[in-house]
Protein backbone atom coordinates (compact mmCIF):
# COMPACT_ATOMS: atom_id res chain seq x y z
CA UNK A 1 0.00 0.00 0.00
CA UNK A 2 1.30 3.43 -0.99
CA UNK A 3 1.15 5.70 2.04
CA UNK A 4 3.52 8.46 0.91
CA UNK A 5 2.65 11.96 -0.22
CA UNK A 6 4.53 14.37 -2.45
CA UNK A 7 4.86 17.99 -1.38
CA UNK A 8 6.02 20.49 -4.00
CA UNK A 9 7.27 24.06 -4.11
CA UNK A 10 3.82 24.98 -5.41
CA UNK A 11 3.07 26.66 -8.72
CA UNK A 12 5.43 29.46 -9.67
CA UNK A 13 5.08 32.69 -11.63
CA UNK A 14 8.54 33.86 -12.69
CA UNK A 15 10.13 36.52 -14.83
CA UNK A 16 11.66 35.89 -18.25
CA UNK A 17 15.45 35.66 -17.97
CA UNK A 18 15.35 34.70 -14.30
CA UNK A 19 15.91 31.36 -12.62
CA UNK A 20 13.78 29.20 -10.35
CA UNK A 21 14.11 26.07 -8.25
CA UNK A 22 11.64 23.21 -8.64
CA UNK A 23 11.51 20.95 -5.60
CA UNK A 24 9.47 18.01 -4.42
CA UNK A 25 9.61 16.16 -1.12
CA UNK A 26 8.33 12.65 -0.47
CA UNK A 27 7.00 12.12 3.05
CA UNK A 28 4.92 9.67 5.10
CA UNK A 29 6.64 6.58 3.75
CA UNK A 30 9.68 4.50 4.65
CA UNK A 31 10.11 3.42 1.03
CA UNK A 32 13.58 3.81 -0.46
CA UNK A 33 13.90 6.35 -3.28
CA UNK A 34 15.80 4.68 -6.10
CA UNK A 35 15.46 7.42 -8.72
CA UNK A 36 13.83 10.79 -9.31
CA UNK A 37 12.91 11.86 -12.85
CA UNK A 38 12.11 15.46 -13.77
CA UNK A 39 9.91 15.83 -16.84
CA UNK A 40 8.05 18.56 -18.69
CA UNK A 41 5.08 17.37 -20.72
CA UNK A 42 6.66 14.39 -22.54
CA UNK A 43 10.28 15.56 -22.28
CA UNK A 44 12.79 14.16 -19.82
CA UNK A 45 14.80 17.00 -18.29
CA UNK A 46 16.92 15.19 -15.73
CA UNK A 47 17.38 12.02 -13.70
CA UNK A 48 18.81 11.65 -10.22
CA UNK A 49 19.66 8.00 -9.60
CA UNK A 50 20.53 6.84 -6.07
CA UNK A 51 23.56 4.91 -7.34
CA UNK A 52 24.61 6.75 -10.49
CA UNK A 53 23.89 10.37 -9.51
CA UNK A 54 22.61 13.05 -11.86
CA UNK A 55 22.07 12.94 -15.60
CA UNK A 56 20.84 16.10 -17.38
CA UNK A 57 19.31 15.67 -20.84
CA UNK A 58 21.69 17.08 -23.47
CA UNK A 59 19.11 19.54 -24.83
CA UNK A 60 18.76 21.13 -21.38
CA UNK A 61 22.38 21.00 -20.21
CA UNK A 62 23.04 24.71 -20.67
CA UNK A 63 19.98 25.88 -18.68
CA UNK A 64 19.28 23.15 -16.13
CA UNK A 65 21.38 22.52 -13.03
CA UNK A 66 20.97 19.67 -10.54
CA UNK A 67 19.83 20.42 -7.01
CA UNK A 68 19.49 21.61 -4.43
CA UNK A 69 18.91 18.11 -3.09
CA UNK A 70 16.65 16.19 -5.44
CA UNK A 71 15.34 19.45 -6.90
CA UNK A 72 16.13 21.12 -10.18
CA UNK A 73 17.27 24.66 -11.01
CA UNK A 74 16.03 26.22 -14.28
CA UNK A 75 18.04 29.18 -15.52
CA UNK A 76 17.64 31.84 -18.26
CA UNK A 77 13.89 31.30 -18.31
CA UNK A 78 11.96 31.89 -21.52
CA UNK A 79 8.21 32.18 -22.14
CA UNK A 80 8.48 28.77 -23.81
CA UNK A 81 9.39 27.25 -20.43
CA UNK A 82 5.82 27.88 -19.29
CA UNK A 83 4.18 24.54 -18.60
CA UNK A 84 3.70 21.70 -16.17
CA UNK A 85 6.71 19.97 -14.62
CA UNK A 86 6.61 16.55 -13.02
CA UNK A 87 8.82 15.08 -10.32
CA UNK A 88 8.53 11.31 -10.53
CA UNK A 89 9.81 9.41 -7.52
CA UNK A 90 10.63 5.74 -8.16
CA UNK A 91 10.62 3.95 -4.81
CA UNK A 92 10.95 0.47 -3.40
CA UNK A 93 8.70 -1.20 -2.46
CA UNK A 94 5.94 1.40 -2.90
CA UNK A 95 6.30 2.12 -6.60
CA UNK A 96 5.96 5.52 -8.30
CA UNK A 97 4.87 8.84 -6.78
CA UNK A 98 4.33 11.92 -8.96
CA UNK A 99 4.27 15.61 -8.05
CA UNK A 100 3.13 18.42 -10.36
CA UNK A 101 4.30 22.03 -10.56
CA UNK A 102 3.05 24.59 -13.07
CA UNK A 103 5.59 27.23 -14.06
CA UNK A 104 4.37 30.46 -15.65
CA UNK A 105 7.06 32.63 -17.21
CA UNK A 106 6.01 36.23 -17.77
CA UNK A 107 7.57 38.95 -19.89
CA UNK A 108 9.43 41.21 -17.45
CA UNK A 109 7.03 44.13 -18.05
CA UNK A 110 4.13 42.15 -16.57
CA UNK A 111 5.97 40.12 -13.98
CA UNK A 112 5.61 42.70 -11.23
CA UNK A 113 2.61 42.19 -8.93
CA UNK A 114 1.03 45.55 -9.65
CA UNK A 115 1.19 45.16 -13.41
CA UNK A 116 -0.03 41.60 -13.76
CA UNK A 117 -3.62 42.47 -14.60
CA UNK A 118 -3.12 45.87 -16.17
CA UNK A 119 -1.56 45.03 -19.54
CA UNK A 120 -3.75 43.16 -22.07
Amino acid sequence: MMTGTIETTGNISAEKGGSIILQCHLSSTTAQVTQVNWEQQDQLLAICNADLGWHISPSFKDRVAPGPGLGLTLQSLTVNDTGEYFCIYHTYPDGTYTGRIFLEVLESSVAEHGARFQIP
Epitope: N11, I12, S13, Q40, N80, T82, L106, F117
Partner: antibody, heavy 117, light 112 residues
Framework: EVQLQQSGPELVKPGASMKISCKAS????????MNWVKQSHGKNLEWIGL????????SYNQRFMGKATLTVDKSSNTAYMELLSLTSEDSAVYYC??????????WGQGTSVTVSS | DVVVTQTPLSLPVSFGDQVSISCRSS???????????LSWYLHKPGQSPQLLIY???NRFSGVPDRFSGSGSGTDFTLKISTIKPEDLGMYYC?????????FGGGTKLEIK
Protein backbone atom coordinates in the same frame (compact mmCIF):
# COMPACT_ATOMS: atom_id res chain seq x y z
CA GLU B 1 -11.36 45.27 -24.68
CA VAL B 2 -10.68 41.66 -23.69
CA GLN B 3 -13.42 39.32 -24.89
CA LEU B 4 -13.88 35.55 -24.89
CA GLN B 5 -16.70 34.43 -27.17
CA GLN B 6 -17.84 30.83 -26.73
CA SER B 7 -19.83 28.64 -29.10
CA GLY B 8 -23.55 28.14 -28.58
CA PRO B 9 -25.55 25.61 -26.55
CA GLU B 10 -25.38 21.95 -27.49
CA LEU B 11 -27.77 19.03 -27.18
CA VAL B 12 -25.89 15.77 -27.71
CA LYS B 13 -26.60 12.07 -27.42
CA PRO B 14 -24.94 9.81 -24.83
CA GLY B 15 -21.72 8.29 -26.13
CA ALA B 16 -21.11 11.11 -28.59
CA SER B 17 -18.26 13.61 -28.51
CA MET B 18 -18.34 17.36 -29.07
CA LYS B 19 -16.09 20.40 -29.24
CA ILE B 20 -16.62 23.81 -27.64
CA SER B 21 -14.80 26.84 -28.99
CA CYS B 22 -13.62 30.01 -27.26
CA LYS B 23 -12.53 32.88 -29.53
CA ALA B 24 -10.29 35.43 -27.84
CA SER B 25 -9.93 39.08 -28.82
CA UNK B 26 -8.54 42.30 -27.39
CA UNK B 27 -5.24 40.89 -26.08
CA UNK B 28 -2.19 38.84 -27.05
CA UNK B 29 -3.68 35.34 -27.22
CA UNK B 30 -0.37 33.51 -26.87
CA UNK B 31 0.69 35.40 -23.74
CA UNK B 32 -1.92 34.06 -21.32
CA UNK B 33 -3.03 30.61 -20.26
CA MET B 34 -6.59 29.59 -21.10
CA ASN B 35 -8.56 27.62 -18.53
CA TRP B 36 -11.73 25.59 -18.76
CA VAL B 37 -14.21 25.34 -15.89
CA LYS B 38 -17.29 23.15 -15.42
CA GLN B 39 -20.42 24.14 -13.53
CA SER B 40 -22.95 21.34 -13.06
CA HIS B 41 -26.62 22.21 -12.49
CA GLY B 42 -25.90 25.68 -11.12
CA LYS B 43 -23.71 24.19 -8.42
CA ASN B 44 -19.98 24.12 -7.76
CA LEU B 45 -17.22 25.18 -10.10
CA GLU B 46 -14.61 22.62 -11.14
CA TRP B 47 -11.30 23.35 -12.86
CA ILE B 48 -10.91 21.07 -15.89
CA GLY B 49 -7.48 22.18 -17.03
CA LEU B 50 -5.53 24.80 -18.93
CA UNK B 51 -3.56 25.30 -22.11
CA UNK B 52 -0.79 27.80 -22.87
CA UNK B 53 -1.27 28.83 -26.53
CA UNK B 54 2.35 29.96 -26.98
CA UNK B 55 3.68 26.39 -26.85
CA UNK B 56 0.53 24.25 -26.60
CA UNK B 57 1.45 23.05 -23.11
CA UNK B 58 -1.44 21.64 -21.11
CA SER B 59 -2.28 20.74 -17.53
CA TYR B 60 -5.34 18.70 -16.60
CA ASN B 61 -7.31 17.95 -13.51
CA GLN B 62 -6.87 14.15 -13.26
CA ARG B 63 -10.66 13.85 -12.92
CA PHE B 64 -11.02 15.02 -16.52
CA MET B 65 -8.16 13.06 -18.10
CA GLY B 66 -9.69 11.05 -20.93
CA LYS B 67 -12.84 13.17 -20.80
CA ALA B 68 -11.55 16.56 -22.00
CA THR B 69 -8.91 17.41 -24.60
CA LEU B 70 -7.65 21.00 -24.86
CA THR B 71 -6.24 22.48 -28.05
CA VAL B 72 -5.68 25.91 -29.61
CA ASP B 73 -5.57 27.41 -33.08
CA LYS B 74 -3.17 30.34 -32.88
CA SER B 75 -4.07 31.58 -36.36
CA SER B 76 -7.65 32.29 -35.29
CA ASN B 77 -6.97 33.06 -31.58
CA THR B 78 -9.31 30.26 -30.61
CA ALA B 79 -9.15 27.69 -27.82
CA TYR B 80 -11.07 24.44 -28.02
CA MET B 81 -12.22 21.82 -25.56
CA GLU B 82 -13.32 18.45 -26.89
CA LEU B 83 -15.50 16.37 -24.58
CA LEU B 84 -15.43 12.63 -25.21
CA SER B 85 -17.88 9.76 -24.64
CA LEU B 86 -20.53 12.00 -23.13
CA THR B 87 -22.86 10.86 -20.38
CA SER B 88 -25.58 12.63 -18.37
CA GLU B 89 -22.87 13.50 -15.79
CA ASP B 90 -21.31 15.77 -18.42
CA SER B 91 -24.44 17.93 -18.70
CA ALA B 92 -23.25 21.31 -17.44
CA VAL B 93 -22.25 24.84 -18.33
CA TYR B 94 -18.62 25.06 -19.46
CA TYR B 95 -16.61 28.28 -19.29
CA CYS B 96 -13.31 29.29 -20.80
CA UNK B 97 -11.35 31.80 -18.74
CA UNK B 98 -8.06 33.59 -19.31
CA UNK B 99 -5.53 33.52 -16.51
CA UNK B 100 -2.34 35.13 -15.38
CA UNK B 101 -0.57 34.57 -12.06
CA UNK B 102 -2.99 31.71 -11.35
CA UNK B 103 -6.16 33.82 -11.26
CA UNK B 104 -8.85 33.92 -13.95
CA UNK B 105 -9.36 37.52 -14.95
CA UNK B 106 -11.72 37.27 -17.96
CA TRP B 107 -14.39 34.64 -18.60
CA GLY B 108 -16.40 33.55 -21.62
CA GLN B 109 -20.19 33.67 -21.45
CA GLY B 110 -20.46 29.91 -20.94
CA THR B 111 -21.64 27.07 -23.15
CA SER B 112 -24.54 24.90 -21.99
CA VAL B 113 -24.17 21.21 -22.82
CA THR B 114 -27.12 18.84 -22.40
CA VAL B 115 -26.57 15.12 -22.83
CA SER B 116 -29.83 13.33 -23.54
CA SER B 117 -31.14 10.59 -25.79
CA ASP C 1 -5.85 17.45 -4.18
CA VAL C 2 -6.06 20.55 -1.99
CA VAL C 3 -9.51 20.78 -0.39
CA VAL C 4 -10.90 24.31 -0.14
CA THR C 5 -13.68 24.81 2.39
CA GLN C 6 -15.83 27.91 2.27
CA THR C 7 -18.10 29.13 5.07
CA PRO C 8 -20.88 29.96 5.44
CA LEU C 9 -22.78 28.17 2.68
CA SER C 10 -25.49 30.81 2.79
CA LEU C 11 -25.33 34.38 4.03
CA PRO C 12 -28.64 36.28 4.44
CA VAL C 13 -27.94 40.03 4.44
CA SER C 14 -29.61 43.42 4.47
CA PHE C 15 -28.37 46.19 2.22
CA GLY C 16 -25.73 48.25 4.01
CA ASP C 17 -24.48 45.27 6.06
CA GLN C 18 -20.81 44.37 6.40
CA VAL C 19 -20.08 40.67 5.85
CA SER C 20 -17.15 38.25 5.82
CA ILE C 21 -16.72 35.01 3.90
CA SER C 22 -14.12 32.49 5.01
CA CYS C 23 -12.02 30.18 2.85
CA ARG C 24 -9.77 27.49 4.37
CA SER C 25 -7.43 25.14 2.54
CA SER C 26 -6.19 21.70 3.53
CA UNK C 27 -2.57 22.80 3.02
CA UNK C 28 -0.66 26.06 2.80
CA UNK C 29 -1.25 28.09 -0.36
CA UNK C 30 2.07 29.89 -0.10
CA UNK C 31 4.66 28.63 -2.55
CA UNK C 32 8.41 28.40 -1.95
CA UNK C 33 8.86 31.98 -3.19
CA UNK C 34 6.35 33.45 -0.77
CA UNK C 35 3.58 33.95 -3.33
CA UNK C 36 0.02 32.90 -2.48
CA UNK C 37 -2.34 32.24 -5.37
CA LEU C 38 -5.75 32.67 -3.74
CA SER C 39 -8.45 34.56 -5.64
CA TRP C 40 -12.13 35.46 -5.12
CA TYR C 41 -14.98 35.52 -7.67
CA LEU C 42 -18.60 36.67 -7.77
CA HIS C 43 -21.02 34.68 -9.92
CA LYS C 44 -24.31 36.47 -10.51
CA PRO C 45 -27.33 34.60 -11.95
CA GLY C 46 -27.28 34.57 -15.74
CA GLN C 47 -23.75 35.97 -15.92
CA SER C 48 -20.20 34.62 -16.02
CA PRO C 49 -18.08 34.58 -12.87
CA GLN C 50 -16.06 37.76 -12.37
CA LEU C 51 -12.71 38.20 -10.67
CA LEU C 52 -12.81 40.35 -7.54
CA ILE C 53 -9.53 39.71 -5.72
CA TYR C 54 -6.28 37.99 -6.73
CA UNK C 55 -3.14 37.17 -4.75
CA UNK C 56 -5.08 37.26 -1.44
CA UNK C 57 -5.70 41.01 -1.32
CA ASN C 58 -5.27 42.68 -4.73
CA ARG C 59 -8.46 44.17 -6.13
CA PHE C 60 -8.96 43.51 -9.82
CA SER C 61 -9.42 46.48 -12.15
CA GLY C 62 -12.82 48.14 -11.66
CA VAL C 63 -13.69 46.30 -8.45
CA PRO C 64 -15.09 48.71 -5.81
CA ASP C 65 -13.02 49.26 -2.67
CA ARG C 66 -15.81 47.91 -0.48
CA PHE C 67 -14.36 44.50 -1.40
CA SER C 68 -11.19 43.50 0.44
CA GLY C 69 -9.26 40.27 0.89
CA SER C 70 -6.95 39.16 3.66
CA GLY C 71 -5.34 36.06 5.15
CA SER C 72 -2.29 33.85 4.81
CA GLY C 73 -1.24 30.20 4.70
CA THR C 74 -4.48 28.23 4.92
CA ASP C 75 -6.95 30.84 6.20
CA PHE C 76 -8.44 33.59 4.02
CA THR C 77 -11.28 36.09 4.24
CA LEU C 78 -13.27 38.21 1.81
CA LYS C 79 -14.93 41.26 3.39
CA ILE C 80 -17.67 43.37 1.82
CA SER C 81 -18.04 46.58 3.78
CA THR C 82 -21.44 47.88 2.62
CA ILE C 83 -23.66 45.41 0.78
CA LYS C 84 -25.34 46.75 -2.36
CA PRO C 85 -27.99 45.04 -4.54
CA GLU C 86 -25.42 44.27 -7.24
CA ASP C 87 -23.34 42.27 -4.75
CA LEU C 88 -25.90 39.45 -4.46
CA GLY C 89 -24.87 36.11 -5.93
CA MET C 90 -22.50 33.21 -5.34
CA TYR C 91 -18.99 33.90 -4.09
CA TYR C 92 -16.16 31.43 -4.73
CA CYS C 93 -12.54 31.29 -3.70
CA UNK C 94 -9.98 29.52 -5.88
CA UNK C 95 -6.54 28.20 -5.03
CA UNK C 96 -4.05 28.16 -7.89
CA UNK C 97 -0.93 27.30 -5.89
CA UNK C 98 -1.22 23.53 -6.24
CA UNK C 99 -2.20 21.27 -9.12
CA UNK C 100 -5.06 20.82 -9.74
CA UNK C 101 -6.57 24.23 -9.06
CA UNK C 102 -9.56 23.88 -6.73
CA PHE C 103 -12.57 26.07 -5.93
CA GLY C 104 -14.33 26.47 -2.64
CA GLY C 105 -17.91 25.19 -2.48
CA GLY C 106 -19.36 28.68 -2.74
CA THR C 107 -21.24 31.09 -0.48
CA LYS C 108 -24.65 32.38 -1.50
CA LEU C 109 -25.15 36.03 -0.58
CA GLU C 110 -28.89 36.63 -0.50
CA ILE C 111 -31.32 39.15 0.89
CA LYS C 112 -32.87 38.41 4.31
Amino acid sequence: EVQLQQSGPELVKPGASMKISCKASGYSFTGYTMNWVKQSHGKNLEWIGLIFPYNGGTSYNQRFMGKATLTVDKSSNTAYMELLSLTSEDSAVYYCARSRSFAMDYWGQGTSVTVSS
Amino acid sequence: DVVVTQTPLSLPVSFGDQVSISCRSSQSLTNSYGDTYLSWYLHKPGQSPQLLIYGISNRFSGVPDRFSGSGSGTDFTLKISTIKPEDLGMYYCLQGTHQPWTFGGGTKLEIK
